[in-house]
């Protein structure tokens, strides 16, 4: 099991990268002047207490920024939020902190991130681009839920 967060670069199948804008993550086309965030991911150390067939449960943070991705309800709808949080503090908790956990599933080069707190809801970007990352139940329609991960060392 990993005990240090792994830095990764994430882009979607349309080659859009994640950028932090006013404390919101948005997906924009990769260009010269765009500086994408580096994502840190670390596996939950209580993997045996989570569902086994949905993927690898991970925490997702913004490298060096003490911000982590989490899911919370806004009204009836789960939403994707950034919270000020040290990813290692989440990792070390005595129980899985489900609101901050995602099942990371890989199929070939494509990765999906499903909320542990809200099964069936996936991190997504609108097909239009320049839009905030969201959670969606609609797979492969107006939203892109497939991402490519590149490990950074």
């Amino acid at each position: 099991k990993s005990e240090m967060p792994q830095p990764v670069s994430i882009q979607d199948i349309n080659h859009r990268v994640w950028v932090l804008q006013d404390q919101i993550l948005i997906a924009v086309p990769r260009k010269d002047r765009v500086s994408p965030v580096t994502i840190s991911l670390i596996s939950c150390r209580h993997v045996e207490t989570l569902e086994k067939d949905r993927g690898n449960p991970i925490y997702l943070g913004l490298n060096g920024l003490n911000l982590c991705l989490m899911c919370a309800k806004a009204g009836d709808q789960p939403t994707l939020q950034l919270k000020e949080k040290d990813i290692m503090d989440l990792y070390n908790q005595p129980e899985p902190v489900k609101s901050f956990l995602f099942y990371h599933s890989q199929s070939g080069r494509n990765s999906t991130f499903e909320s542990v707190a809200f099964p069936g809801w996936f991190i997504a970007v609108s097909s239009e681009g320049g839009c905030p990352l969201i959670l969606t139940q609609e797979l492969g329609k107006a939203n892109t839920t497939d991402f490519g991960l590149t490990m950074l060392f």
Partner: antibody, heavy 121, light 109 residues
């Protein structure tokens, strides 16, 4: 408001089994962890185990592995503790508690009123 | 298995300060033990006070604080009130299981 209401006192004979219920209101048990703890007469608290009602996974103190079984019925928002092969040493008050993450830590924020289980021949 | 030990009883004057401690048989208590403190008042439900060693649970008065002190988990009550008379239990995490202490009966006299 948030409440955990447990079933009533039980008197059992040695070797028998007992099932204690813990009905939650004011929140969905699938959104948290339910812990079970016991207190024998004149003793401190003992952790029995916990269940994640959303997926049914459990953890037990080694001492209670095989003795206690934790389950939930999410349709009725109820958690259960079943104890088998009862002995006089199992006489205790059994508590359920919510163990919830808020802000930056997990807390035991709400407790049931306790269920006295007496094992006597 | 680890044994967690607390003072059986302590007395504090109203308005005074008292520190309850929680010792581990396995050595120094650290933040990795994620100490929890709960309170039991006669005839009332248990109440969670502290989680994660030093984080006060929502709604808990500021006079209660958690810390590490000399290799033990500690609960300090500053400005004790008569209503703080109760039993206090600590619980420490050891990897994937939790161990409670025997409790401290606190008298406010």
């Amino acid at each position: 408001q948030v409440q955990l209401v447990q079933s009533g006192a039980e008197v059992k004979k040695p070797g028998a089994s007992v099932k204690v219920s813990c009905k939650a209101s004011g929140f969905n048990i699938k959104d948290t962890y339910i812990y079970w703890v016991r207190q024998a007469p004149g003793q401190g608290l003992e952790w029995i185990g916990r269940i994640d009602p959303a997926i049914g996974t459990t953890r037990y103190d080694p001492k209670f592995q095989g003795k206690a079984t934790l389950t939930t019925d999410t349709s009725t928002n109820t958690a259960y503790l079943e104890l088998s092969s009862l002995r006089s040493e199992d006489t205790a008050v059994y508590y359920c508690a919510r163990y919830d993450y808020s802000g930056s830590s997990f807390y035991f924020d709400y407790w049931g009123q306790g269920t006295l289980v007496t094992v006597s021949s | 298995q680890a044994v967690v030990t607390q003072e059986p009883s302590l007395t504090v004057s109203p308005g005074g300060t008292v520190t309850l401690t929680c010792r581990s048989s396995t050595g120094a208590v650290t933040t990795s033990n994620y100490a929890n403190w709960v309170q039991e008042k006669p005839g009332q439900l248990f109440t969670g006070l502290i989680g994660g060693t030093n984080d006060r649970a929502p709604g808990v008065p500021a006079r209660f604080s958690g810390s590490l002190l000399g290799g033990k988990a500690a609960l300090t009550l500053s400005g004790a009130q008569p209503e703080d008379e109760a039993d206090y239990f600590c619980a420490l995490w050891y990897s994937n299981h939790l161990v409670f202490g025997g409790g401290t009966k606190l008298t406010v006299l």
